[in-house]
Interface confidence: low
């Protein structure tokens, strides 16, 4: 058969939960301390909460059935009677009473024809302000007759026909009634919730609703123009040109900021937005939802997208509606011909209308922002340049911040990209130019996206002119080639000599993408003498071992994930892993990761890696070779190899360093 509507699915779930109590029994959730009852969906059933309030489960006859004395459940179908009597069956006795007062209406409800009545519950009538009720029952009850006729449709309409966003023609001056049928199974009629639906009568159907509904005369724009509390909003809408949309056809929800909401924002910020057509349009669009959302439809947190594209979390807490967890809705369900308005007393400023400063203030990067300000870069973060700010997380600075000197200023300038980027468009190998004049590289890995040594730690925040990338560490731009890096650090003097001996200098100086696991002098000194002599006595073997320390792509620590098998220039793979923030290669910890170079990255290690073929199965007693013996071997080898003869002085240097 046809797909069930959300309402029918929820009813089916309630029936399922109630079946152990007999046929046609529905489980109903009642909010403790209120008379609010709901057929229960799966999520609510397990959470036992509606709008954050605890509920109790009761079991009632499903719509259209009744109990039979002495029998389990609700085995009997309710007898069909006319509409007037069915009002009594559903408990809408006040509607019956007011129908009697009109004189004309009862004969209609008892007579031939086919009608639908959206009947307010007794509580709904009782909650009307006294002056409203008085006005209904005065004037020879003509107002009452009109009001009741507005609750009626001149044909039978069952819930499976009540589609989201449809309008029904009422029996009062053919005025429209707005229907919304939400995915959670809640159905509203002019934002009044259907409590008991589809009660058949011989001449139609009765739906019990939780409010007395009234005609809708104004569109959203007209309501904005009438209400004093929307003075600022009115000016903003006029300036943005959105009034055409807000007075046109469609179904929108306007989260309408009151004057008070605008007053909470500093004038400078507000006027920056009001004076910027694009930011203003984004601001206003962030208060508009693409469909009408009545308050009664919200029974738990719900993600909704605004016209601006931002996702808002609409929820509820008791009787209060919340936006992003805050109870800022002061007046709800003001109906318009083209949607619904909820008054809010706090402005929802989207990222797209914010400066970089404002974006950063809401992120975990305040320490970095202070540094940018102290370094005199504040103007870039609040101006109209198209920029991307690479801001390290506060946790990066847990051990303190650097002094603001020329070096730090330059470093910070290299955290600002001269373009407004979006991470989703970044690609591997892309270069980005900084305010400091550096070219930074983009590395795309399976589970991370990195710029040089620093990886993106949170979703981008795209502002009016600038985008904020939250980064997991301070970014260090490359200062030279891998060879330059190694030569410039006296921890690697022995490695540099070995690289020169092995003829790999040119490789590590030219353009390329290398990951170099760089053993320190200590690592070389720690080699068993036999290994050391073997290494230094054979230029080919030395080259082989050193190539095993060089991966054929750039792998920064943020790109490792759990385990990466990195192909080395020697041919075998290196097992690189990250555990508890410690990088390891072949299970040996890296002492210092991510020293960036223009043609690669250097990771400092305190041991020399052995390719699989070279790893001894067991280490017996090695010869306690002295440095002199190693040198003899190197010299002997050099006589057999012209290339080694050329490099003998380098070996000598290497051996001399090993003595110390």
């Amino acid at each position: 058969g046809p797909a069930k509507s959300p309402y029918q699915l929820v009813l089916q779930h309630s029936r399922l939960r109630g079946r152990q109590h007999g046929p046609n029994v529905c489980a109903v959730q009642k909010v403790i301390g209120t008379n609010r009852k709901y057929f229960t969906n799966c999520k609510q059933w397990y959470q036992r909460k509606i709008c954050g309030k605890s509920t109790v489960i009761s079991y009632e006859c499903c719509p259209g059935y009744e109990k039979v004395p002495g029998e389990k459940g609700c085995p009997a179908a309710l007898p069909l009677s006319n509409l007037y009597e069915t009002l009594g069956v559903v408990g809408s006795t006040t509607t019956q009473l007011y129908t009697d007062r009109t004189e004309k209406l009862r004969p209609e409800m008892e007579g031939p024809g086919s009608f639908t009545i959206f009947a307010p519950s007794n509580e709904a009538w009782a909650s009307l302000p006294a002056e409203v009720l008085d006005s209904l029952v005065s004037n020879v009850n003509i107002e009452l007759l009109n009001a009741l006729r507005y609750h009626m449709v001149g044909r039978r309409v069952l819930t499976d026909e009540l589609k989201h966003g449809m309008t029904l023609t009422s029996m009062y001056q053919n005025s429209n009634i707005q229907i919304h049928h939400y995915p959670n199974g809640i159905v509203t009629v002019n934002c009044a919730r259907l409590l008991k639906a589809d009660h058949h009568a011989t001449n139609g159907v009765v739906h019990l609703i939780d409010k007395v509904i009234s005609t809708i005369t104004n569109n959203i724009q007209q309501i904005i123009e009438i209400e004093d509390t929307f003075e600022t909003l009115r000016a903003a809408v006029a300036a943005s040109g959105l009034n055409t949309m807000l007075e046109g056809n469609g179904q929108y929800t306007l989260l309408a900021p009151t004057n008070e909401a605008f007053e909470k924002i500093p004038s400078e910020t507000l006027n920056r937005i009001l004076g910027d057509p694009e930011a203003l349009r984004d601001l206003l669009n962030n208060h508009i939802l693409k469909s009408a959302m009545c308050a009664e439809a919200i029974v738990a947190g719900l993600s909704v997208e605004t016209l601006e594209g931002t996702t808002l979390e609409v929820g509820c807490s008791g009787d209060m509606l919340t936006i992003n967890g805050k109870a800022i809705i002061s007046n709800k369900d003001i109906l318009a011909t083209n949607g619904v308005i909820h008054y809010i007393d706090e402005l929802l400023i989207p990222d797209s209308a914010k400066t970089l400063f404002e974006l950063a203030a809401e992120s975990d990067v305040s320490t970095a922002i202070d540094l940018f300000r102290q370094a005199g870069l504040g103007n870039h973060l609040s101006g109209s340049e198209r920029l991307t700010l690479l801001a390290p997380l506060n946790s990066v600075f847990k051990d303190g911040t650097p002094p603001i000197d020329a070096h730090t200023r330059n470093l910070l300038r290299n955290h600002i990209i001269k373009d407004q980027l979006a991470s989703k468009y970044l690609y591997h190998g892309q270069t980005l130019e900084t305010l400091g004049g550096k070219k930074l590289r983009v590395f795309v890995y399976r589970n991370s996206l990195c710029i040089e040594n620093s990886c993106i730690a949170a979703h981008d925040k795209r502002g009016r002119y600038g985008t904020l990338f939250t980064m997991d560490r301070v970014l260090t731009p490359p200062m030279g080639t891998v060879m330059d890096v190694l030569k410039g650090d006296n921890r690697f003097s022995m490695l540099v000599a070995a690289i020169q001996s092995a003829g790999l200098t040119e490789t590590l100086n030219r353009e390329g993408v290398y990951t170099v696991f760089a053993p320190t002098n200590e690592a070389f000194r720690a080699l068993p003498p036999r290994e050391r002599s073997r290494l230094l006595g054979d230029a080919k073997e030395l080259a082989n071992i050193l190539k095993y320390h060089i991966g054929d792509e750039i792998l920064v620590s943020g790109g490792i994930g759990a385990l990466v098998r990195l192909k080395s220039l020697q041919g075998d793979k290196l097992e690189v892993s990250l555990k508890n923030n410690v990088v390891s290669v072949n299970k040996e910890p890296v002492a210092e990761p991510d020293i960036m170079a223009t043609n690669g990255v250097v990771h400092v290690i305190t041991n020399v890696l052995q390719p699989p073929a070279n790893r001894p199965q067991e280490r017996g007693d090695e010869l306690a070779d002295s440095a002199l013996e190693i040198f003899k071997q190197a010299s002997a080898f050099s006589r057999a190899s012209q290339r080694s003869v050329r490099l003998a002085p380098v070996y000598q240097k290497l051996l001399e360093r090993m003595k110390h």
Epitope: A235, A239, E263, P266, S267, E268, T269, L270, N271, R272, L274, G275, K354, T355, F357, E358, A361, E362, S366, I369, D370, R373, S382
Partner: antibody
């Protein structure tokens, strides 16, 4: 350099009206927020009204709301303050002030002021 | 409305000495989204219009001598003249531009002792 020259001050009876003008030069008038600030004799400064660069947004102190109207004519580089239903407490030197930039801000440049005396 | 209160009402300082005056707002002028304080300081000499000295609570307007400095955050602010000169005799006003209506302090009159 920025020049702001106020005119239109004078003596007026309570209930009367005056229109102050401020001729601006030395900057692009249409790019700046403009303000009127007043100072009663021997007293402190009081902000009176603001107008945005495009003239859309106007703000008034409660003490003048409904009686004073701020406006601007960018073709003439002139700021105006129409003052109706004047009261004795409106007696003050009225300064024409330029904002810092095209956004609402602090009071960056001040004219020499024009004196308004409301007296019977 | 945000009320601005300056202290002292008047201040007499010897030439070359440090002059310090305070300004307190009835609510915070620090906007968390950009970490800026919406406060300005002005100097008014007799018979002249006010002149902008400081904005954002601590940023000196160009052309203002560096003996003038502003400090403070939130609700408490200070204007300091590190070495008083004869031409500094004036009334000094603080002003908030965090929220309309923009309001000034009542002023601090600075004289030479």
């Amino acid at each position: 350099q920025v020049q702001l020259v106020e005119s239109g001050g004078g003596v007026v009876q309570p209930g009367g009206s005056l229109r102050l003008s401020c001729a601006a030069s030395g900057f692009t008038f249409s790019d700046y927020y403009m303000y009127w600030v007043r100072q009663a004799p021997g007293k402190g400064l009081e902000w009176v009204a603001t107008i945005s660069d495009g003239g859309i947004y106007k703000y008034y102190a409660d003490s003048v709301k409904g009686r004073f109207t701020i406006s601007r004519d960018s073709s003439k580089n002139t700021l105006y303050l129409q003052m109706n239903s004047l009261r004795a407490e409106d007696t003050a030197v009225y300064y024409c002030v330029r904002g810092w930039d095209r956004y609402d801000s602090w009071f960056a440049s001040w004219g020499q002021g024009t004196t308004v005396t409301v007296s019977s | 409305d945000i009320v601005m209160t300056q202290s002292p009402d008047s201040l007499a300082v010897s030439l070359g000495e440090r002059a310090t005056m305070n300004c307190k707002s009835s609510q915070s002028l620090l906007y968390s989204s950009n970490q800026k304080n919406y406060l300005a300081w002005y100097q008014q000499k007799p018979g002249q219009p006010p002149k902008l000295l400081i904005y954002w609570a601590s940023t000196r307007e160009s052309g203002v001598p560096d003996r003038f400095s502003g400090s403070g955050s939130g609700t408490d602010f200070t204007l300091t003249i590190s070495s008083l000169q004869a031409e500094d005799v004036a009334v000094y006003y603080c002003q908030q531009y965090y929220r309309y209506p923009y309001t000034f302090g009542q002023g601090t009159k600075l004289e030479i002792k």
